[in-house]
Interface confidence: low
């Protein structure tokens, strides 16, 4: 969490941002909140990015003002206009690109004063893994697949019964480049699976950590997956 204050003493307002990660090709949110004003027309929101000449986004007098917007963001940004009045200056970024990563500044002007806070935005690709029993294999194996990751993640298998066991000798992981030549499909196979056990396939890079669990018993197979972003820090 980053909390910024205006530069000039009594004419300062508190602006708060939260570091976050964007999944390339999808839409992302750059979070920013501020002390609200009672008049929408008195609020100016400017989003800037370090190293970029033009603005990322500007909202003033109750509407978007995009004539000074940098070309790399044109047609891809929006604020939540109906929430500005309650102090939400968060920016929606469409079709996140790798090059969108960097330091952003959320700069706010209201009738109460000015304030700003920086936000670190990481970009990459992350997706939920799915673990299945691989019935094509000669012996009982598990197959963990996740369609989109970048940068290349690590894959670790774990089991509930054999806690602390190292499965690297009995697993094989491959990374297949996707058609857009950036993200990769992750496939990991675990051999010599025993029944009445729960196995976890953990995929992690510096942006996200995702886990796919599978419980294998004689009578049923249960699956569960979850994904966690690693760098969501507030400022």
């Amino acid at each position: 969490l980053i909390i910024g204050f205006g530069i000039s003493g009594r004419h300062s307002i508190t602006v708060t941002t939260v570091a976050s990660a964007g999944n390339i090709g999808e839409d992302g949110i750059l979070s920013c909140t501020f002390e609200p004003d009672i008049k929408l027309s008195d609020i100016v929101i400017q989003w800037l990015k370090e190293g970029v000449l033009g603005l990322v986004h500007e909202f003033k007098e109750g509407k978007d003002e995009l004539s000074e917007q940098d070309e790399m963001f044109r047609g891809r940004t929006a604020v939540f206009a109906d929430q500005v009045i309650v102090g939400n200056a968060s920016l929606r970024l469409k079709n996140v690109q790798l090059t969108d990563a960097g330091t952003y500044k959320c700069y706010i002007i209201t009738s109460k004063g000015k304030g700003n806070a920086n936000l670190e935005y990481k970009t990459g690709a992350f997706s939920m893994p799915e673990v299945n029993v691989d019935y094509n294999a000669s012996s009982e194996t598990l197959r963990c697949e996740a369609p989109r990751w970048f940068p290349q993640p690590t894959v670790v298998w774990a089991s509930q019964v054999d806690q602390g066991a190292n499965f690297s000798e009995v697993s094989n992981t491959s990374f297949e480049l996707n058609s857009e030549n950036v993200t990769m499909k992750v496939v990991s196979v675990l051999y010599n699976v025993t029944i009445n056990n729960t196995y976890s396939c953990m995929i992690e890079n510096d942006i996200a950590k995702a886990t796919g669990d599978i419980k294998v018993t004689e009578s049923e197979i249960k699956r569960r997956s979850h994904l966690q972003l690693l760098n969501s820090k507030a400022s």
């Epitope: 000449l53 033009g54 004539s67 940098d70 070309e71 790399m72 079709n95």
Partner: antibody, heavy 120, light 108 residues
Framework: EVQLVESGGGLVQPGGSLRLSCATS????????MSWVRQAPGKGLELLGF??????????EYSASVKGRFTMSRDNSKNSLYLQMNSLKTEDTAVYYC???????????WGQGTTVTVSS | DIQLTQSPSFLSASVGDRVTITCRAS?????MHWYQQKPGKSPKPWIY???NLASGVPSRFSGSGSGTEYTLTISSLQPEDFATYYC???????????FGGGTKVEIK
Amino acid sequence: EVQLVESGGGLVQPGGSLRLSCATSGFTFSDYYMSWVRQAPGKGLELLGFIRNKANGYTREYSASVKGRFTMSRDNSKNSLYLQMNSLKTEDTAVYYCARDSHRTYFDYWGQGTTVTVSS
Amino acid sequence: DIQLTQSPSFLSASVGDRVTITCRASSSVSSMHWYQQKPGKSPKPWIYATSNLASGVPSRFSGSGSGTEYTLTISSLQPEDFATYYCQQWSSNPPMYTFGGGTKVEIK
């Protein structure tokens, strides 16, 4: 050095078609919005449309005067911009320019222009 | 859609004169760009983002304005300044670049 060079202009009959090309060099073509602008004899500048960059999915916008008749495209492997003009009218007679958006909503580089004459 | 109206359309002036060209937008815009064009040549970027001179543009040129009215001023007209000047802006809704009709600066 940034360069934009148009070609493909000429004399065409009303109702005919023509394809203009704009070969570019000296910059990363896929990073930029590219536009076509024309200028009828003795008249002002008229934007025909533009095609966005890679980050914005190469989507296109057209002015009302040419929508449905003209099609813009780009070949990023060849660093080239194209304008396919169909159902040409006499009022399409003009010098046609390709132009690069500077990242700041104005055109920082223009081609030398290619002349299209629509006449029977 | 935003329309840009330039005035005057034609302007006769002498070397050394102070010249002002106006561009009016049909609704408020936050910046304006200007181009210079000479006969048989491509337009050249002249002033961008209301008041910034493009590379190589002499300091006798200046730009100003806000809202719906923008101006290009030449403090002391020189022989090489005789040309046509166009204003231009970017509108995001609908997304489009718009040009003014042009102002031709001629020798008196």
